[in-house]
């Protein structure tokens, strides 16, 4: 499994994973304690065919072309999770791991 | 977690799995002995903002809205294996359980 | 320079009420959650309560609950602790801090007597 | 509430001695356990947050380890300014709670 990395200045159009910093104070998010950014990371980039494709299912809805099946789409293929510390909504604050927080690998699917 | 079920009387136009059998018969793929044909599904359909989104990370990229980030997609969020009896392409027959052949749910991401 | 500073602090008869202040500077107040935490004479830490960086959201123990309310003025750097039907077991010397995953930055107290 | 049980209570030690405090939690807390030295009359200080990461400005000769419900601060190399109470906190769900403190005395 691997997946193409890039960033502002790339000129790559195929699906790739970009840097993106999740600024949460942005959001006006004041329940979330910390942290206060994070690098999310994000998928962009065109799925052509069996290009960066992580299940084998993909490349046979593309041979039995279904109606209304779309080609494969640029989305997170590895995902981590990231410790945060926030307010429940129940007067409590948690510590917590928040699972599929930060885009690992990009591919098609 | 949870999605939508489809079939090809459904108007639904959100995102949603629809029934798909493969073929491998038709296909022309001779070196998979069994099964010649399964239940795949696939995912097709729109995803507006929030809908059946699965990871929170595609809610926080839509928020930091970063250059060239598509909507998300509809994708398949939770997929099984299937087993299989083929040739490996080295004269010999392999029984084995191939990942991520069935779709079983399908979401934005 | 992260710089915190307690006042309000002095001698309350039981039953009787507080309102403590915490000047902050060095950093922008308004981006951080802010805690209260008391240290009894000769005793450990305890925690009083937490504030969310917009004022929003407040927590504290059942201890000091529905008699102390944390509030803040970001305008003003201000963070504060209004205390209510004192009683003697409140008495200590009560902290401000800055909040991340830890409390990583403390004024320097100030002492609350309760007694009659 | 989730209790903080700090040992030992007080140490004796020299300088140049490797010092380490333990905290157990009453149930698991994952990483969310961070460390503190407070002097007499003064604030308390962060040393070390989310078990093992250290606070900006702390010398390194202090660590923390451990996740879960068993955590340790060690002092690799103990210096003269290093004679202090050290506490424990938690905080994976509030009420947060502190460990009773160490008192690290000079030997």
């Known amino acids: 499994d691997f997946g193409l990395d890039c960033d502002e200045h790339s000129t790559e159009s195929r699906c790739c994973r970009y840097p993106l910093t999740v600024d949460f104070e942005a959001f006006g998010w004041d329940w979330i304690i910390a942290p206060k950014r994070y690098k999310a990371n994000y998928c962009s980039g065109e799925c052509e065919f069996v290009f960066l494709q992580k299940y084998p299912h993909t490349h046979l809805v593309h041979q039995a072309n279904p109606r209304g099946s779309a080609g494969p789409c640029c989305t997170p293929t590895k995902m981590s999770p990231i410790n945060m510390l926030y307010f429940n909504g129940k007067e409590q604050i948690i510590y917590g791991k928040i699972p599929a927080m930060v885009v690992d690998r990009c591919g098609c699917s | 977690d949870f999605g939508l079920d489809c079939d090809e009387h459904s108007t639904e136009s959100r995102c949603c799995r629809y029934p798909l059998t493969v073929d491998f018969e038709a296909f022309g793929w001779d070196w998979i002995i069994a099964p010649k044909r399964y239940k795949a599904n696939y995912c097709s359909g729109e995803c507006e903002f929030v809908f059946l989104q699965k990871y929170p990370h595609t809610h926080l990229v839509h928020q930091a809205n970063p250059r060239g980030s598509a909507g998300p997609c509809c994708t398949p969020t939770k997929m099984s294996p299937i087993n299989m009896l083929y040739f490996n392409g080295k004269e010999q027959i392999i029984y084995g359980k191939i990942p991520a052949m069935v779709v079983d749910r399908c979401g934005c991401s | 320079e992260v710089q915190l500073l307690e006042s309000g602090g002095g001698l309350v008869q039981p039953g009787g009420s507080l309102r403590l202040s915490c000047a902050a500077s060095?950093?922008?107040?308004?981006?951080?959650?802010m805690s209260w935490v008391r240290q009894a004479p000769g005793k450990g830490l305890e925690w009083v309560s937490t504030i969310s960086s917009g004022g929003s959201y407040t927590s504290y123990p059942d201890s000091v609950k529905g008699r102390f309310t944390i509030s803040r003025d970001n305008s003003k750097n201000t963070l504060y602790l209004q205390m209510n039907s004192l009683r003697a077991e409140d008495t200590a010397v009560y902290y401000c801090?800055?909040?991340?995953?830890?409390?990583?930055?403390w004024g320097q107290g100030t002492l609350v007597t309760v007694s009659s | 509430d989730i209790q903080m049980t700090q040992s030992p209570s007080s140490l004796s030690a020299s300088v140049g001695d490797r010092v380490t405090i333990t905290c157990r939690a009453s149930?698991?807390?994952?990483?969310?356990l961070n460390w503190y030295q407070q002097k007499p009359g003064k604030a308390p200080k962060l040393l070390i947050y989310a078990a093992s990461s250290l606070q900006s400005g702390v010398p390194s000769r202090f660590s923390g380890s451990g996740s879960g419900t068993d955590f340790t601060l060690t002092i690799s190399s103990l210096q003269p300014e290093d004679f202090a109470t050290y506490y424990c906190?938690?905080?994976?769900?509030?009420?947060?709670?502190f460990g009773g403190g160490t008192k690290v005395e000079i030997k």
């Open positions: 801090a800055k909040q991340d995953y830890a409390m990583n930055y």
């Open positions: 060095g950093f922008t107040f308004s981006s951080y959650a």
């Open positions: 906190q938690q905080s994976y769900s509030t009420p947060w709670t």
């Open positions: 149930q698991s807390i994952s990483t969310a």
